[in-house]
């Protein structure tokens, strides 16, 4: 609450997060032309990426393009990309939607369709839908420990969200345990009025707001965090503005002296930890 | 503008960026002692790195040291590093400029020069100039989509820079389309009075400032972003303070049971998105 | 100092860091059943990770789990994890402490102990102590160059911590060179009253605070940074809240057509650069 007589100072904050959980993923795996059901285990080293300070990322879904090589090939026949003759293909042209640079030739993509040939990582990425349900939908049960150290330098005051009295096997609950800083990912979504299973397919951005409203006067001292949650990406976003949250990364390797890569389009939740508030003192 | 009767509150912000573009890179490639011109395609997975929240990086140039192995070898004969006898080489010494730990021996680097032997990733990185023009100079034509969600918790007000009415095929222009949040990298540099082609060689840091000056009173409501651009690294910086922007990373692999790495010195532009402003309400 | 007649504005900041140093690491290496002493060199590409804006990470210690494969195996017999019969093992159960999903069978871990079989990356990570002393304890002698560009947009004022007059071979010292922005990591710890050698074992978070108290009035202009240091993680933290600072990452590879990974549990110091302050002008 506003105490007009107080000198207010914004919070200086540092955050450290630790995600825990294992996901079992079942997907169709094609080897030597044969498709069969594959099971695999994903742990933190597989689904999260180190070191983001005030945000962390949990992969909930993915599409892989394996064994890509730099060469020439027909581009993927997405809407409006097909051709019937070389005239439709412009040498040196890079369509922002495409994944390569056109050679100027119109070539067969398959039995029925022709597309412009491109110089690219081939075969080019198929523009297929993200798997539904999401492959790592069980990430809903992962937990994240959030450690937050705050400082009001002008008041020479430091504290943190985890107190020595706290229990490391707690789980945050708005009513029963509002000071616990271990959060189940599914609960964060529920608190924000969002459906984890749905968002996990395309990915999204979730805000974890930590509000410190600190009264540092000795006679009425109070300085504990309040947690709240809200979705930060626009779920009603037009397709052209790239809804959800995904990024591509590659694993490079050599096979028979040929440089190859596996391209992973990773969908997931980026959690942004937004720390704000003030410290007031007479 | 300052309305003194209003209660002002700083903005809480979350940013999501998406870079698009393909670069064709032509460089000399040496294989089996034969040097020939090599062409390769770089897409987002090759030139950018995932997940940086308020900043993103686009690689515009690079120097590779391939097939490095942990062993002993002569260090690179940079200025002041040559020796004529073992006395000049100090066992266990790590010169901050060097890439290894001296063994104490002065050994031939080539026909004419001798340098101190080091325990290091060998052969040690050659201190050669960044290629000029930059290998990915065509990154000037890449575009970045910036999504910015802002919140004034005290006023319980949330909005974002992308409105449902916006067109996903727009490109930002200060006069013709100042609300479009898709930016051509070359345009950002032009707006900041900088030369992309030049900066791309050594790398640099570019600030994209998003200023929200929000009047949240219902009778004169206004809350839209204003974009501006300025270079953040010092282009006149002394050599000793590492001008430009680069970092080294490695790709590790095994060959004939020997642990090897390719060291990449990546030069590029780090774009920092600096969001600031206030929300005022009676 | 507070000048009440001035219009105060918070600082907008951008940070760029560059770490320098080489570490020689000596550890026991087991190959073909034979254990011998191995020496290796770590340079920036080996111990630090690119691109964190306001924070950077230096690995000071690690534990490796090499050659893991996705299959079935007994889980690690940590406290409370042993079993005597299948009844103790619940098919499909994921213990948050475990590294896999139970199959429901109780199987031999070694001659004397049995544990629940899991579907996991096998053999599962041994829960062994971080090496003591830390493997990269010599990181104490690494240096970091910090470049900080600041902006007060309302006052249209920009400056940086590195001035043209500065000497690139300086090292920060509170008394003798308080404006030098090259810091020895060990000195940062000493200034904060912490023991680098000790913290390097489990890792930790260190804050580098840069305070700008700027008087922008022309008649008494002053705008230079003040550096201070404080530890941000809680050294007295209960085991259940994960003391120190570590994360796991993996290097994936194929051997005889089998997908494998080396899991690295990296301990280290995350340095958070916390820039704050105000610019005041009549």
């Amino acid at each position: 609450s506003d105490k007009l007589y107080q000198r207010k100072e914004p919070v200086i904050s540092s955050v450290h997060t630790k995600v825990k959980g294992i996901a079992e993923v079942t997907e169709n795996v094609t080897e030597g032309g044969v498709t069969k059901l594959g099971h695999s285990i994903f742990d933190t080293a597989d689904y999260t990426f180190p070191l983001q300070g005030n945000s962390f990322f949990v992969m909930t879904n993915y599409v892989k393009s394996e064994g890509q090589v730099q060469t020439l090939c027909p581009e993927y026949p997405r809407r409006g990309a097909q051709c019937s003759s070389d005239r439709r293909c412009k040498k040196g042209w890079m369509d922002p939607q495409s994944k390569g640079i056109q050679t100027g030739r119109c070539v067969p993509y398959d039995k029925t369709r022709k597309t412009c040939e491109v110089s690219a990582w081939c075969p080019t990425e198929e523009e297929k839908e993200a798997p539904r349900p999401a492959l790592l939908r069980s990430a809903e049960n992962f937990t994240v420990l959030i450690k937050n150290n705050i400082h009001f330098p002008g008041h020479n005051y430091t504290t943190r969200n985890i107190l020595p009295t706290m229990n490391g096997s707690c789980t945050f609950h708005k009513t029963w345990d509002p000071q616990c800083s271990i959060f189940r990912l599914g609960d964060i979504f529920q608190e924000a009025g969002e459906n984890f299973t749905e968002v996990a397919v395309q990915g999204g951005i979730m805000g974890i707001e930590i509000y410190w409203d600190c009264n540092l006067d000795s006679w009425s001292h109070h300085c504990r965090p309040r947690y709240s949650f809200r979705r930060l990406d626009d779920k009603n976003m037009d397709e052209s503005f790239v809804p959800g949250y995904n990024f591509r990364y590659a694993k490079y390797y050599k096979e028979n002296n040929v440089e190859k890569r596996t391209l992973i389009k990773a969908f997931g939740i980026r959690f942004d930890i937004l720390v704000f508030g003030t410290g007031g003192k007479f | 503008s300052d309305k003194l009767y209003q209660r002002k509150e700083p903005v809480i912000s979350s940013v999501h960026t998406k870079v698009k573009g393909i670069a064709e890179v032509t460089e000399n490639v040496t294989e089996g002692g034969v040097t020939k011109l090599g062409h390769s395609i770089f897409d987002t997975a090759d030139y950018t790195f995932p997940l940086q929240g308020n900043s993103f990086f686009v690689m515009t140039n690079y120097v590779k040291s391939e097939g490095q192995v942990q062993t002993l070898c002569p260090e690179y004969p940079r200025r002041g590093a040559q020796c004529s006898s073992d006395r000049r080489c100090k066992k266990g010494w790590m010169d901050p400029q060097s890439k290894g730990i001296q063994t104490g021996r002065c050994v031939p680097y080539d026909k004419t020069r001798k340098t101190c032997e080091v325990s290091a990733w060998c052969p040690t990185e050659e201190e050669k100039e960044a290629p000029r023009p930059a290998l990915l100079r065509s990154a000037e034509n890449f575009t970045v989509l910036i999504k910015n969600n802002i919140h004034f918790p005290g006023h319980n007000y949330t909005t974002r820079n992308i409105l449902p009415t916006m067109n996903g095929s727009c490109t930002f222009h200060k006069t013709w389309d100042p609300q479009c949040s898709i930016f051509r990298l070359g345009d950002i540099f032009q707006e900041a009075g900088e030369n992309f082609t030049e900066v791309a060689v050594q790398g640099g840091i570019m600030g994209i400032e998003i200023y929200w000056d929000c009047n949240l009173d219902s009778w004169s409501h206004h809350c839209r972003p204003r974009y501006s651009f300025r270079r953040l690294d010092d282009k006149n910086m002394d050599e000793s303070f590492v001008p430009g922007y680069n970092f080294r990373y490695a790709k590790y692999y095994k060959e004939n049971n020997v642990e090897k790495r390719t060291l990449i010195k990546a030069f590029g532009i780090r774009f920092d998105i600096l969001v600031f402003g206030t929300g005022g309400k009676f | 100092s507070d000048k009440l007649y001035q219009r105060k504005e918070p600082v907008i900041s951008s940070v760029h860091t560059k770490v320098k140093g080489i570490a020689e690491v000596t550890e026991n290496v087991t190959e073909g059943g034979v254990t011998k002493l191995g020496h290796s060199i770590f340079d920036t590409a080996d111990y630090t990770f690119p691109l964190q804006g306001n924070s950077f990470f230096v690995m000071t210690n690690y534990v490796k789990s090499e050659g893991q494969v996705q299959t079935l195996c007994p889980e690690y017999p940590r406290r409370g994890a042993q079993c005597s019969s299948d009844r103790r093992c619940k098919k499909g159960w994921m213990d948050p402490q475990s590294k896999g999903i139970q199959t429901g069978r109780c199987v031999p871990y070694d001659k004397t102990r049995k544990t629940c079989e899991v579907s996991a990356w096998c053999p599962t990570e041994e829960e062994k102590e971080a090496p003591r002393p830390a493997l990269l304890r010599s990181a104490e002698n690494f240096t970091v160059l910090i470049k900080n560009n600041i902006h007060f947009p309302g006052h249209n004022y920009t400056t940086r911590n590195i001035l043209p007059t500065m000497n690139g071979s300086c090292t920060f010292h509170k008394t003798w060179d308080p404006q030098c922005s090259i810091f020895r990591l060990g000195d940062i710890f000493q200034e904060a009253g912490e023991n680098f050698t000790e913290v390097a074992v489990q890792g930790g978070i260190m804050g580098i605070e840069i305070y700008w108290d700027c008087n922008l009035d022309s008649w008494s202009h002053h705008c230079r940074p003040r550096y201070s240091f404080r530890r941000l993680d809680d050294k007295n933290m209960d085991e259940s809240f994960v003391p120190g600072y570590n994360f796991r990452y993996a290097k994936y590879y194929k051997e005889n057509n089998v997908e494998k990974r080396t899991l690295i549990k990296a301990f280290g110091i995350r340095f958070d650069i916390l820039v704050f302050g105000t610019g005041g002008k009549f």
Partner: nanobody, 115 residues
């Protein structure tokens, strides 16, 4: 699924020549040849993109083998000269999406080079 029919295999003396042909049931971007010697894994020999651009050869056959495409007939041929005993194998025709990527293989035709 693409049907592939190879022809032209046989017995030839070291140093001799042989021409293999293959017809596909439908048009495809790339066509190529693989081979498998007894007790060894199947290996790539040569590949050709649409209209013979680009072409790619295994190091072991460069300068001795030539691949050529006939787009109109959905066909590919492999002219092999300077044959060596180590070229002995079953040769398979294949089609795919680039000169590095193949999805469908024929039944194979035997090539034996005697010394």
């Amino acid at each position: 699924e693409v049907q592939l029919v190879e022809s032209g295999g046989g017995l030839v003396q070291a140093g001799g020549s042989l021409r293999l042909s293959c017809a596909a049931s439908e048009r495809t971007y790339s066509m190529g040849w693989f081979r498998q010697a007894p007790g060894k894994e199947r290996e790539f020999v040569a590949g050709s993109g649409w209209d013979g651009i680009p072409t790619r050869y295994a190091d072991s056959v460069k300068g001795r083998f030539t691949i050529s495409r006939d787009n109109a007939k959905n066909a590919v041929s492999l002219q092999m000269s300077g044959l060596k005993p180590e070229d002995t194998a079953i040769y398979y025709c294949a089609t795919g999406t680039s000169v590095y990527h193949y999805q469908y293989w024929g039944q194979g035709t035997q090539v034996t080079v005697s010394s």
